[in-house]
Each structure stands twice: as structure tokens, then as C-alpha cells.
């Protein structure tokens, strides 16, 4: 997992709430699941289910947990050391170049093409030309064959946010 979490909001600054455990920084940094105090003398635990940190750090705030959007399912909840993992619902997918939303998978291939790949949470169905075997560009076909796809079973999350 990377140190820079993509576009995560910061959790509200955490003053010493009673439920937040404190410990001393180790060599000036705080462990995963904690952030550093403003004077640099304490490590303060993140709040389970609200915020997190994944690395040894000198963050002044833990990072706010991602909330899965409608159209997504939660694969694993947010812990103090790992962000929520969200995945597109069955029949939808998220492409790397448009990660902001889940898009509906096509229900079939254009005429003259055959389906070689199912809809998965991270890819649309894959169509190839019957003769040449070259891939279809992915535009929604004007005319669809009666061949339809069944949503693929997810093998891994399509979007790791943390």
C-alpha cells in the first residue's frame, strides 16, 4: 500500500479523547494505526471505523475512512491500519481511467464478435472478432447479438483505496 492515499479527506483533528490510546513515538515516528501529536511527543491511536493510517508516519491527523458509494459493495471494513475496500456491484465495473464511478457492463457483443471475457468488477465483457481474434474497442454496440454475459465472480477488489 502506498503512503499517499488517493484523495482521502483528513479526519477532524484528534485531541486527547479518553478512548484514544497514547504511546511514545519510536525514533520520531508513529506506528500504523496512529498519528503524531502536535508537540511530537505522543502517538495517538486512530478511531476504529472512522479513520486510519497505514504506515509509520508523522501525520498530524489520521486519514478518514472511505465510505463505499451506492453501486459499490464493501469487501472489507475500515480498520485503524487499513482503509475500507470497496468493489463495484455485480454487473458493473470500474475502469482504471475512470475510477470515480462503476459503469454497467454490456450485455452482449456486437454482431460478428464473440465474447471471450466476462464482466468483472474491474472490466467490461471482452469481445473479439470471430475471424481475426482482435479485441473490440469497448464502445457500446449499436446492434447486439443474443449472446449475453453472466456477471463474473469477483476474484479481487477493483478499487483498493488504502
Amino acid at each position: 500500500e502506498s503512503a499517499l492515499i488517493t484523495q482521502q479527506d483528513l479526519a477532524p483533528q484528534q485531541r486527547a479523547a479518553p478512548q484514544q490510546k497514547r504511546s511514545s513515538p519510536s525514533e520520531g515516528l508513529c506506528p500504523p494505526g496512529h498519528h503524531i501529536s502536535e508537540d511530537g511527543r505522543d502517538c495517538i491511536s486512530c478511531k476504529y471505523g472512522q479513520d486510519y493510517s497505514t504506515h509509520w508516519n508523522d501525520l498530524l491527523f489520521c486519514l478518514r475512512c472511505t465510505r463505499c458509494d451506492s453501486g459499490e459493495v464493501e469487501l472489507s471494513p475500515c480498520t485503524t491500519t487499513r482503509n475500507t475496500v470497496c468493489q463495484c456491484e455485480e454487473g458493473t465495473f470500474r475502469e482504471e481511467d475512470s475510477p470515480e464511478m462503476c459503469r454497467k457492463c454490456r450485455t452482449g457483443c456486437p454482431r460478428g464478435m464473440v465474447k471471450v471475457g466476462d464482466c468483472t468488477p474491474w472490466s467490461d465483457i471482452e469481445c473479439v472478432h470471430k475471424e481475426s481474434g482482435t479485441k473490440h474497442s469497448g464502445e457500446v454496440p449499436a446492434v447486439e447479438e443474443t449472446v449475453t454475459s453472466s456477471p463474473g465472480t469477483p476474484a479481487s477488489p477493483c478499487s483498493l483505496s488504502g
Epitope: 520520531g28 515516528l29 491527523f61
Partner: antibody, heavy 119, light 106 residues
Framework: EVMLVESGGGLVQPGGSLRLSCAAS????????MSWVRQAPGKGLEWVAT????????YYPDSVKGRFTISRDNAKNTLYLQMNSLRAEDTAVYYC????????????WGQGTLVTVSS | DIVMTQSPSSLSASVGDRVTITCKAS??????VAWYQQKPGKAPKLLIY???TRHTGVPDRFTGSGSGTDFTLTISSLQPEDFATYFC????????FGQGTKVEIK
């Protein structure tokens, strides 16, 4: 007087490697968290790596993770940045920086060393 | 990442002028903002941290203010040695910087 002096910059081909050094003096080096920050030509500054005072813990941004390694030798008062699989976009002036005592931000910087990645 | 938008990118001023540089964070960073001064070929110098605390040896003509998302560096009366580039930095979540403001002689 706090002094940080970087060295090791130069011209390297894409895919190549380079190791930068930063010689520290004027303070107890082993007590401070240290970082590398870079500035590409005509662009803003970008944090590159951070290492704990004893050298046990490190962290990096996405852009360099898995390619760059920060390390330190407290006996020699020296900070290092090993840069592998260099890309054209890594071309920048690289600064070594010290995190202050109670401010959680950089209080002293070196004057930088230029790394140019080009074929 | 938290984006720090600094303005203006450059300005021309005369000795004795009052100069104001602003920095806007893309989300709340509390008061975890520092301001630095840099001259060509030199190391950046810390001026202000925690948004308004002057670093050791920094003249009192340099003043920082703001909290949340809006921050300002003010030089009350510009001196010849103040012509330089200034940049802001947030340090609440990792470290990100403004693009810099070049203060030039009018």
C-alpha cells in the same frame, strides 16, 4: 550552525541508478527525522521520502515507492537516497531536509543537488 | 493529496511595500502550515510554522496568519534582502507544497 550538504547528483540515463548523499553537521544527527524533497524544473516541491531518527522506519509517496530507498548512517552523520529505475520525470533538484524539534515540519534544508534523467 | 494553491505566482514590489501572499488548502489542515523563503541556488529557509509562529531569527516584518484552508504570509515593509521566492507547505497529511510566489523588484 546547522549544515546539510547534498552530493551525488548528475546525468543518468532512463532506467539507470544514482545514490545521493547528504552530509549533516552542526546538530545531533541521530536525534532527527530526515527527509528528501525534490523540485522539478519550473515546478513545485514534492516530498520524496522520510526516515526515522534511528533509521528503522521509512515511508514514501506513490511516485517513488519501490524505486527509491532512503537510508542513513548515524555514525557518519550522513543521509542517503538510492534511486533506481530512474525516469525522465525524476529530473529535479533533490534537497535533504531535517524535521524540527517540536514543529513536525522541515526547519533546515540543504541547497540541493541536480539529478538529470535523459538519454 | 492535499493541494496547496498559492497566489500570486509572481509579483513586483518596491522596497518599503507591504506584500501579501496567500495559500489555499484543498481541505482543512488546521494550522499545520509553514512558509519558506528561497533564493536562487540557496537552501530554502523556514520563516513561519504552525501558520503564525516565526522561526528563530526571522524578522518581525514577516507575519503568518490563517487556519483551516486559508493562509496568508505578509511582509509589512519589504527590504532589499526579501526579494526571493516564497512557498507554503501543509504538513497535516504527509507534505505538500504551494507552487511558489516570486517577489521581484519593481
Amino acid at each position: 550552525e546547522v549544515m546539510l550538504v547534498e552530493s551525488g547528483g548528475g546525468l543518468v540515463q532512463p532506467g539507470g541508478s544514482l545514490r545521493l548523499s547528504c552530509a549533516a553537521s552542526g546538530f545531533t544527527f541521530s536525534s532527527y527525522v530526515m527527509s528528501w524533497v525534490r523540485q522539478a524544473p519550473g515546478k513545485g516541491l514534492e516530498w520524496v521520502a522520510t526516515i526515522s531518527s534511528g533509521g528503522s522506519y521509512t515511508y514514501y509517496p506513490d511516485s517513488v515507492k519501490g524505486r527509491f530507498t532512503i537510508s542513513r548512517d548515524n555514525a557518519k552523520n550522513t543521509l542517503y537516497l538510492q534511486m533506481n529505475s530512474l525516469r525522465a520525470e525524476d529530473t529535479a533538484v533533490y534537497y535533504c531536509a531535517r524535521r524540527g524539534d517540536s514543529m513536525i515540519t522541515t526547519d533546515y534544508w540543504g541547497q540541493g543537488t541536480l539529478v538529470t534523467v535523459s538519454s | 493529496d492535499i493541494v496547496m494553491t498559492q497566489s500570486p505566482s509572481s509579483l513586483s514590489a518596491s522596497v518599503g511595500d507591504r506584500v501579501t501572499i496567500t495559500c489555499k488548502a484543498s481541505q482543512d489542515v488546521g494550522t499545520a502550515v509553514a512558509w519558506y523563503q528561497q533564493k536562487p541556488g540557496k537552501a530554502p529557509k523556514l520563516l513561519i510554522y504552525w501558520a503564525s509562529t516565526r522561526h528563530t531569527g526571522v524578522p518581525d516584518r514577516f507575519t503568518g496568519s490563517g487556519s483551516g484552508t486559508d493562509f496568508t504570509l505578509t511582509i509589512s515593509s519589504l527590504q532589499p534582502e526579501d526579494f526571493a521566492t516564497y512557498f507554503c507547505q501543509q504538513y497535516s497529511s504527509y507534505r505538500t507544497f504551494g507552487q511558489g510566489t516570486k517577489v521581484e523588484i519593481k
